[in-house]
């Protein structure tokens, strides 16, 4: 169940895809990645108010229990629902290789 | 990549499975669920310090960028890695039915 996409906190405040520019140094990859030198990292950032983009039944339960016990149960969290692959040119024992990482760039977000 | 399971914040402080007891009223289910009357909800709660139970490359990136830009990029979040099914006896238009929910109870946790 993918619930409401209307953010009650105001435009852009709720869970959505953001792009953060990062260098290989920022990522701690400079010693093993040759390319790309800079990555447009897409990630899921934002609040998860009641039933906003609830990923599943568990997220709905979490919302209900957070409302009841906010000190014990955290609100649902904005995380990737799916990913885009990314290809890196990386150093290997024998030289250099292309490697696809399927879980590197967020493609879509939900609350869980 | 499922990284270190050692919690640097002290025992039980990092992302792990917790059990929260909840009634049908707590969950907002009283009008459509007959049984169970009380649910032992297993959910993922706790901090996600650097590389602790990192779910994938995305989580590792998030850790690195959170360290660099804590106001922009949140730390990884403790969420279910897998679920246990749960069977509810629920009301239907025609009476009562058994229904299995595959995404209700967290079974295992990771940081993402």
């Amino acid at each position: 169940a993918r619930n409401g996409d209307h953010c009650p906190l105001g435009p852009g405040r709720c869970c959505r895809l953001h792009t953060v520019r990062a260098s290989l140094e920022d990522l701690g990859w400079a010693d093993w990645v040759l390319s790309p030198r800079e990555v447009q990292v897409t990630m899921c950032i934002g609040a998860c108010p009641s039933q906003f983009r609830a990923a599943n039944m568990h997220a709905q339960i979490k919302t209900s229990l957070h409302r009841l016990k906010p000190d014990t149960v955290p609100a649902p969290c904005c995380v990737p629902a799916s990913y885009n692959p990314m290809v890196l040119i990386q150093k290997t024992d024998t030289g250099v290789s292309l490697q696809t990482y399927d879980d590197l760039l967020a493609k879509d977000c939900h609350c869980i | 990549a499922r990284n270190g399971d050692h919690c640097p914040l002290g025992p039980g402080r990092c992302c792990r499975l917790h059990t929260v007891r909840a009634s049908l009223e707590d969950l907002g289910w009283a009008d459509w669920v007959l049984s169970p009357r009380e649910v032992q909800v297993t959910m993922c709660i706790g901090a996600c310090p650097s590389q602790f139970r990192a779910a994938n490359m995305h989580a590792q990136i998030k850790t690195s960028l959170h360290r660099l830009k804590p106001d922009t990029v949140p730390a990884p979040c403790c969420v279910p890695a897998s679920y246990n099914p749960m069977v509810l006896i629920q009301k239907t238009d025609t009476g009562v039915s058994l229904q299995t929910y595959d995404d209700l109870l967290a079974k295992d946790c990771h940081c993402i």
Epitope: S35, P36, V87, D93, G95, V96, L98, Q99 | -
Partner: antibody
Amino acid sequence: EVQLLESGGGLVQPGGSLRLSCAVSGFSLSSYDMTWVRQAPGKGLEWIGIISGSGNTYYASWAKGRFTISRDNSKNTVYLQMNSLRAEDTAVYFCARGILVYADYGDHNLWGQGTLVTVSS
Amino acid sequence: DIVMTQSPATLSVSPGERATLSCQASEDIYTNLAWFQQKPGQPPRLLIYAASTLASGIPARFSGSGSGTEFTLTISSLQSEDFAVYFCLGVYTYISAEGAFGQGTKVEIK
């Protein structure tokens, strides 16, 4: 000695299929990326695609769907399967070790001598 | 799709002179670029990789420079064996990976 030897070329009719082989010796295929390149008579070089050491494949956009790169590590051989061949696919087909824009350790320039594919009726 | 554009198509140079060949990428390819020399009936020979690193066994008169989208191959003093066709190859990676050669520059004797 480290070597690459292409085979499987020849005359094929338009619409036909052909599988080229690149037999390698002197190194383990699973440790290296392998690239296929072609060159039409009197023309420039054309990048076809790569199979990585981990088995992922990457293709030029024009090659996607018609050309497939695979490998058999036990036979130390890389393959280029070509389908729905057209006259403009007539070329010498080369295999080469590595991704070419960066050097592998050791031999920096390992290419086969090429195999000629002629598509004609 | 990545497109590599070489210029000029033909370069007429006298032996002993300097030759400068250009290659432009349609995408930012960082230093994912190599230069090859090819003579008739032979496979290409790697001269420069990573945009500026001289391949083993290649004379020091060959040098490469550039990054991003603009690249140059320089032959400081042309020898008779340097008259050949030169190709650049770029590889672009992001959500996938794709390579492309430039159309080639023929270096001929003036």
